[in-house]
């Protein structure tokens, strides 16, 4: 039975040319995290594998940085980065947990960030 829940940074906004941290946190389960995938729509951005470490997809290597933690940092944002992002936690024995974040990249310099949470 899957008892865990994923907390995310929710709906967030950022300024064009800036950077943003996408963060998910899996709680309420003792399941072992074997891998975390970060995806944008149907595109794989990055993988953090327990054995291998971080792999950033080649097409995003210039603008995506691993971390902090299991999160992902997007840099040099453009309006085309607006959209849904998913953190996919592969765990044992629970299976797969998915969290959703919506990022809006704004032209203006008054980008207001949505509610953020801090991971201890």
């Amino acid at each position: 039975m899957m008892t865990g829940t994923i907390e995310t940074t929710g709906n967030i906004s950022a300024e064009k040319g800036g950077s943003i941290i996408l963060q998910c946190h899996l709680s309420s389960t003792t399941a072992q995290v074997t891998q975390v995938n970060w995806e944008q729509q149907d595109q794989l951005l990055a993988i953090c594998n327990a054995d291998l470490g971080w792999h950033i997809s080649p097409s995003f290597k210039d603008r995506v940085a691993p971390g902090p933690g299991l999160g992902l940092t997007l840099q040099s944002l453009t309006v085309n980065d607006t959209g849904e992002y998913f953190c996919i936690y592969h765990t044992y024995p629970d299976g797969t947990y998915t969290g959703r974040i919506f990022l809006e990249v704004l032209e203006s310099s008054v980008a207001e960030h949505g509610a953020r949470f801090q991971i201890p």
Epitope: Q32, T34, Q35, N37, N49, A50, D51, L52, H55, P58, H90, T91, Y92, P93, G95, T96
Partner: antibody, heavy 124, light 108 residues
Framework: EVQLLESGGGLVQPGGSLRLSCAAS????????MSWVRQAPGKGLEWVSS????????YYADSVKGRFTISRDNSKNTLYLQMNSLRAEDTAVYYC?????????????????WGQGTLVTVSS | EIVMTQSPATLSVSPGERATLSCRAS??????LAWYQQKPGQAPRLLIY???TRATGIPARFSGSGSGTEFTLTISSLQSEDFAVYYC??????????FGGGTKVEIK
């Protein structure tokens, strides 16, 4: 710390059989794929066989298909390679290796963690 | 079966120099390529996977490049502990998963 310890190697006559074991510790064994890779003396590496975490999928190199059987006992955290109809060309150090992928995340068939190897010598 | 060919078979390099090792696949393997280092009497050590991603704990002097059929492992400044045999391996989604014949990097 991930540890893989092979055993069961030794000298066997052509046509004979051996069963290799690989005892795993330091990680949750059951979700991870496992593989056997061998290396003949003074030669390169050769992939032999792989098995999924559940044991439901197995793969073999053509050179051992029909003669070798890979299996696992998740309750004992142990991987096996049953080798029958052994030939001189099967002489090698046999390594077990942990796949970084699981049934959930998908398999890669690349290996960060290896055992120290066990030598199988097939000779009359 | 995809055949992996490494060149040169032996590479003589002085400590501190750059070493460039090549690996060619008989058909495209996309970026499904790994590099291993092996020293005598030891198990192989994973260096690079996905053609260019360093595995955890691998020094930055090791870098991989290429895709499709042509791949390169570069060691930017050889240290004494880098003298070893290096293998490439393809892991396209379906077996068999094949290794190259190896390149021995020796002290010049």
């Amino acid at each position: 710390e991930v540890q893989l310890l092979e055993s069961g190697g030794g000298l066997v006559q052509p046509g004979g059989s051996l069963r290799l074991s690989c005892a795993a510790s330091g990680f949750t064994f059951s979700p991870y794929g496992m593989s056997w890779v061998r290396q003949a003396p003074g030669k390169g590496l050769e992939w032999v066989s792989s098995i999924s975490g559940s044991g439901g999928r197995t793969y073999y190199a053509d050179s051992v298909k029909g003669r070798f059987t890979i299996s696992r006992d998740n309750s004992k955290n142990t991987l096996y390679l049953q080798m029958n109809s052994l030939r001189a060309e099967d002489t090698a150090v046999y390594y077990c290796a942990k796949d970084p992928g699981t049934d959930s995340s998908g398999y890669y068939y690349i290996w960060r963690y290896w055992g120290q190897g066990t030598l199988v010598t097939v000779s009359s | 079966e995809i055949v992996m060919t490494q060149s040169p078979a032996t590479l003589s390099v002085s400590p501190g120099e750059r070493a460039t090792l090549s690996c060619r696949a008989s058909q495209s393997v996309s970026s499904n390529l790994a590099w291993y280092q092996q020293k005598p009497g030891q198990a192989p050590r994973l260096l690079i996977y996905s053609a260019s991603t360093r595995a955890t704990g691998i020094p930055a002097r090791f870098s991989g490049s290429g895709s499709g059929t042509e791949f390169t492992l570069t060691i930017s400044s050889l240290q004494s502990e880098d003298f070893a045999v290096y293998y490439c391996q393809q892991y396209v989604p379906h077996p068999p998963f094949t290794f190259g014949g190896g390149t021995k990097v020796e002290i010049k």
